[in-house]
């Protein structure tokens, strides 16, 4: 009566777990009052008609990680109390019509990680109480209209990791309660206008890792509750001006790994909960005024690995909370002196791997809290007098791999660096490129007697995009910092210190934050 099959373990008869390769069919007899049955890691290849007929009280049934490839239509007959059914991680290619008929209480159906090639409206037409449907990791190529029409209570639908090439605009139209829709890792090339219009309660939409090229202007206009929107690793080349205008709840937005060439002013509507915006690995060439002005709470902006050659002076207007700005690996040659003026809370800025030839003296004027500045691998020959003097929290400055011109004009910078060596790190130090007689020598310890009067040597190299030094531009990238023990460089070794700018003792050597976005 309460018998437990020898291949299984039964806890108080109501909980049954059957595991092991020796099991090749559903064990019998199963306790009549079983409420939970798990059949895991067996060699069962098929489910016959009504193997669970005598356990009608079953609430949860997990048949996972088996060799299951065939199921008879009546396999789940008489399981009217079943709330949770998982057939995940099996080898199912086809689902018989009517398989889920009579499962009136079913709330969660997991069919993920099988080999399903199609689903039909008739498969789920009886599952009116279903709240969660997991179909990810199958071989679905299309979803027919009506497939989900009866699942009006569905809150979570995962169709990720399939082979979907297109989606009908009507397929989700009756899913007004849906909160999570995952379509990641498919082959979608476009999303028709209206596809998500009925999803008024949607909070998460995952579209990453598809081949989407264009987004319809009003694609998300009905999704005011959207909080997470994943669009990364697609082929999106442009963003319609109003695409993000009505998403006030958004707190995660990924757009990296696309083909975006430009961002129009105000493209990002008010998103008070958005803390990070990742736009790396696109083809952006310029940043106009006010492009991010609505993102008042943004703390991290990643624009690295684009082709940005121009930044308008007001591009970063409104980013009063920004702490980290990554612009590394772009095509910047010049920066306006006011471009960072509004970024009062900025702590980390990454400008490495660009083509910067000079910096305005006031470039960091308003950014008093800067802690890290990455300027390596540019085309800087010198820096303006006092450019870093007011940066009392600066603890990491990277200047190597620039063609420093070590004539007498370099002395103010050389002397500042001499007093601030710990900020440079000990991994790679800046070295002179010209004149030829001091090329390769450390800028910090250059013998000033050798330094010639200010003569511009026409030997400015054009560093290739991929240079000889180790690539540190991958994101998230964090420049490794060696110990900040001060280098031993006795002042008396230097013959001319008359132009030293004596800076205040900032006692920042113990500071630890060293991120470079």
């Amino acid at each position: 009566y309460y018998g437990c099959p020898s291949e299984c373990t039964c806890s108080r008869a109501s909980q049954v777990e059957c595991t092991g390769a020796r099991i090749v069919a559903v064990p019998t007899p199963l306790p009549w009052n079983a409420m939970s049955l798990q059949i895991l890691n067996t060699h069962i290849t098929e489910l016959s008609e009504s193997p669970f007929l005598n356990i009608s009280a079953l609430i949860a049934l997990r048949i996972e990680k088996n060799e299951l490839s065939h199921i008879m239509p009546g396999a789940f007959r008489n399981l009217g109390s079943l709330r949770y059914l998982s057939l995940a991680n099996n080898k199912l290619q086809v689902l018989p019509i009517g398989l889920f008929q009579g499962l009136d209480s079913l709330e969660s159906l997991l069919l993920s990680s099988n080999q399903l090639v199609q689903i039909q409206p008739a498969h789920f037409s009886q599952c009116s109480n279903l709240k969660e449907l997991q179909l990810h990791g199958n071989h679905l190529e299309y979803i027919p209209d009506g497939a989900f029409d009866h699942l009006v209570g569905l809150t979570k639908l995962n169709l990720g990791k399939n082979s979907l090439t297109h989606i009908s605009p009507r397929v989700f139209q009756h899913l007004g309660n849906l909160q999570v829709l995952r379509l990641y890792e498919n082959r979608l090339t476009d999303i028709p206008m209206g596809t998500f219009d009925g999803l008024v309660n949607l909070q998460e939409l995952a579209l990453q890792q598809n081949q989407i090229g264009l987004l319809s202007p009003g694609l998300f206009h009905n999704n005011h509750n959207l909080q997470r929107l994943y669009l990364s690793n697609n082929h999106i080349s442009q963003l319609p001006p109003s695409i993000f205008m009505q998403l006030p709840q958004l707190n995660r937005l990924t757009l990296f790994g696309n083909s975006l060439k430009e961002l129009s002013p105000g493209i990002f509507g008010p998103m008070p909960n958005l803390r990070e915006l990742w736009l790396y690995d696109n083809h952006i060439t310029s940043l106009p005024d006010n492009v991010f002005s609505n993102l008042r709470q943004l703390q991290v902006l990643i624009l690295s690995r684009n082709q940005i050659s121009f930044i308008s002076p007001g591009a970063f207007n409104g980013l009063t909370e920004l702490r980290e700005l990554s612009l590394h690996t772009n095509a910047l040659q010049d920066l306006d002196g006011n471009v960072f003026r509004m970024l009062a809370n900025l702590q980390n800025i990454s400008l490495q791997n660009n083509r910067l030839r000079q910096l305005p003296g006031n470039i960091f004027a308003n950014v008093n809290g800067l802690m890290t500045i990455q300027l390596q691998n540019n085309q800087l020959e010198n820096l303006p007098l006092g450019i870093f003097d007011h940066l009392g929290k600066l603890c990491e400055l990277r200047l190597y791999d620039n063609p420093w011109r070590c004539d007498s004009d370099i002395l103010p910078l050389r002397n500042w660096l001499l007093l601030n060596q710990p900020r440079l790190g000990t991994d790679t130090v800046p070295v002179c490129f010209s004149p030829a007689n001091v090329r390769g020598q450390s800028l910090i310890i250059i013998n000033v007697n050798v330094a010639v009067p200010s003569v511009h040597v026409p030997e400015v190299p054009s560093y290739p995009e991929t240079s000889w030094y180790p690539d540190t531009s991958s994101y998230p990238d964090t420049t490794s910092i060696s110990s900040t023990t001060e280098l031993t460089s006795p002042v008396e070794d230097y013959t001319d210190l008359t132009t030293i700018q004596v800076t205040d003792d900032r006692s920042v050597w113990g500071m630890t934050q060293a991120q470079s976005g």
Epitope: Q179, E204, G517
Partner: antibody, heavy 122, light 107 residues
């Protein structure tokens, strides 16, 4: 193996300051968000702060905002919590944890340290 | 701030029992909810993420369900090592609040 080890907990008087550290090992620290959670004696868990993988983004619970500062040093695989203006109600075990999330629905504090005790008392 | 409430606050059960713990959110949090187990003097341990996904290495007797505002953690057959306190936590928005906990002890 993957682990987090907190240190720096101590007895401190009200109004005082303390700096907690969390040393990470066994995983690529710079790839993960990190977080601090505390638990007052006999009470439940309280999330207090987290920090983005590069250190740029931070967030705080209202109960500690303006008094606590979270930071990290990816080169040293270390997370920090600088606590100032400490109050008796800050007395708790402080845990650091790895905040693992991805765009496929994973969200969880999957690795925790053993905790370090902070006592604020006169 | 999203407030999570758990019920019951404590329960007594026997080895082999099926245990159900509920967590309710003050507003919809989609499926951005995790469940943790904590034993006295130890750090919490992640059991369930995304409301229903089992964390790697966690026994299959644990399961989670729900979305929106109502969530459930189920222990299909209580084992001696399962006596502990269980917490839910939401990741939908900051601050990432925890529920007050449910203590499961021996009957």
């Amino acid at each position: 193996q993957v682990q987090l080890v907190e240190s720096g907990g101590d007895l401190v008087t009200p109004g005082g300051s303390l700096r907690l550290s969390c040393a990470a090992s066994g995983f690529t620290f710079s790839d993960y968000y990190m977080t601090w959670i505390r638990q007052a004696p006999g009470k439940g868990l309280e999330w207090i702060s987290d920090i983005g993988s590069s250190g740029g983004s931070v967030d705080y619970a209202d109960s500690v905002k303006g008094r606590f500062t979270i930071s990290r040093d990816n080169a040293k695989n270390s997370l920090y919590l600088q606590m100032s203006s400490l109050r008796a109600e800050d007395t708790a075990v402080y845990y650091c944890a790895r905040y693992n999330w991805n765009d496929r629905g994973y969200d969880g504090f999957d690795i925790w340290g053993q905790g370090t005790m902070v006592t604020v008392s006169s | 701030e999203i407030v999570l409430t758990q019920s019951p606050s404590s329960l007594s059960a026997s080895v082999g029992d099926r245990v159900t713990i509920k967590c309710r959110a003050s507003q919809g949090i989609s499926s951005a909810l995790a469940w943790y187990q904590q034993k006295p003097g130890k750090a919490p341990k992640l059991l369930i993420y995304d409301a229903s996904s089992l964390e790697s290495g966690v026994p299959s007797g644990f399961s989670g369900s729900g979305s929106g505002t109502d969530f459930t953690l189920t222990i299909s057959s209580l084992q001696p090592e399962d006596f502990a306190t269980y917490y839910c936590q939401q990741f939908n928005s900051y601050p990432h609040t925890f529920g007050p906990g449910t203590k499961v002890d021996i009957k």
